[in-house]
């Protein structure tokens, strides 16, 4: 008899090169049988896993999967680091393996100057 | 310098197409990201969509059946088409360049607007 | 959609006073830029994410707030300061402009 459990199909030590300035979207496989879990994205930083609260996500329903996704619209420098997605169900929390964010920065530093560096230049 | 320029018809019939050419100077198109947004005196200022750099394109759900977003990198231009006119289409286009810092995105530059009037 | 609503919609300030303006987020955004615009020109980046002032804009503007309320505050209005001030969200799509807050000069 098939599991009925919530599971996260996300491959332990999964990683992502992208590019700073595009958008990507970062997907949590879910297996799911009757209703839907809660799902969310936290980013950890170091020891603990904090909570994506003002990111856009959405679902897309596939035949045997859904896939919980975390938009980067677009993806900035600061989005580099390790995600893991989480199901609330039936009171249990469970957690995927995380996934790491390579960012390169194409608009790198000495290529343009930075918004802080224009403003100063403007008043020097 | 950072340069957009905005070039359309002015006055479209109801239920035709529009199509506006933005040809952008000081900075390419792989690496900057350029939206359209407009500004109607009903509706204020609205977010049409964006051609990201890598050619990606996302639109606001509300016009996105009716919008099209295209560039040529080469020709420093990008495109908006956008089907089915009615009057309350009428408004400012303007095309906007994006740019990130570490840890946020926002529109930098715009162009000076190109006007467009719906009417028979 | 992220409803951003400015208030108030106009404000008319003398010389030398200081003004606030708010933008309150119908759901949480993670910063807020503003933009200013002239009659007859395109708006002009005026502070992002927040805080931080864009190029050439006088050290009187600042702006502050989280999640879904933020402000724009001129420690002392000068004439030049008369203008239409719109708060913008790149939370989440589609991305949206509030009303806007019409600064005058009284």
């Known amino acids: 008899k098939e599991s009925c459990d919530v599971q996260l199909y996300i491959k332990r030590q999964s990683e992502h090169s992208i590019l700073a300035g595009d958008p990507f979207e970062l997907e949590c496989p879910v297996k799911y049988c009757a209703n839907r879990p809660h799902v969310t994205w936290c980013k950890l930083n170091g020891t603990t896993c904090v909570k994506l609260e003002d990111r856009q996500t959405s679902w897309k329903e596939e035949k045997n999967i859904s896939f919980f996704i975390l938009h980067f619209e677009p993806v900035l420098p600061n989005d580099n680091g390790s995600y893991r997605c989480s199901a609330n169900f039936q009171s249990n929390l469970i957690e995927s393996h995380s996934t790491t964010l390579y960012v390169t920065d194409v608009e790198s530093a000495s290529e343009r100057p930075s918004k802080d560096e224009m403003a100063s230049r403007f008043w020097a | 310098q950072v340069q957009l320029k905005e070039s359309g018809p002015g006055l479209v019939a109801p239920s035709q197409s529009l199509s506006i050419t933005c040809t952008v100077s000081?900075?390419?198109?792989?690496?900057?990201?350029v939206h359209w947004v407009r500004q109607s005196p009903g509706k204020g200022l609205e977010w049409l969509g964006v051609?990201?750099?890598?050619?990606?394109?996302s639109y606001n759900p509300a016009p996105m059946s009716r919008l099209s977003i295209s560039k040529d990198n080469s020709k420093s231009q990008v495109f908006l088409k956008m089907n089915s006119l009615q009057t309350d289409d009428t408004a400012m286009y303007y095309c906007?360049?994006?740019?990130?810092?570490?840890?946020?995105?926002?529109?930098?530059?715009w162009g000076q607007g190109t006007s467009v009037t719906v009417s028979s | 959609q992220i409803v951003l609503s400015q208030s108030p919609a106009i404000l008319s300030a003398s010389p030398g006073e200081k003004v606030t303006m708010t933008c309150r987020a119908s759901s949480s955004v993670s910063y807020m830029h503003w933009y200013q615009q002239k009659p007859g020109s395109s708006p002009k980046p005026w502070i992002y994410?927040?805080?931080n002032l864009a190029s050439g804009v006088p050290a009187r503007f600042s702006g502050s707030g989280s999640g879904t309320s933020y402000s724009l505050t001129i420690s002392r209005m000068e004439a030049e300061d008369a203008a239409t001030y719109y708060c913008?969200?790149?939370?989440?799509?589609?991305?949206?402009f509030g009303g806007g807050t019409k600064l005058e000069i009284k």
């Open positions: 000081g900075f390419s198109l792989t690496t900057y990201g």
């Open positions: 994410a927040t805080s």
């Open positions: 906007v360049r994006g740019d990130y810092e570490y840890d946020y995105y926002a529109m930098d530059y």
């Open positions: 051609m990201w750099p890598g050619g990606r394109t």
């Open positions: 913008h969200q790149w939370s989440s799509n589609p991305y949206t």
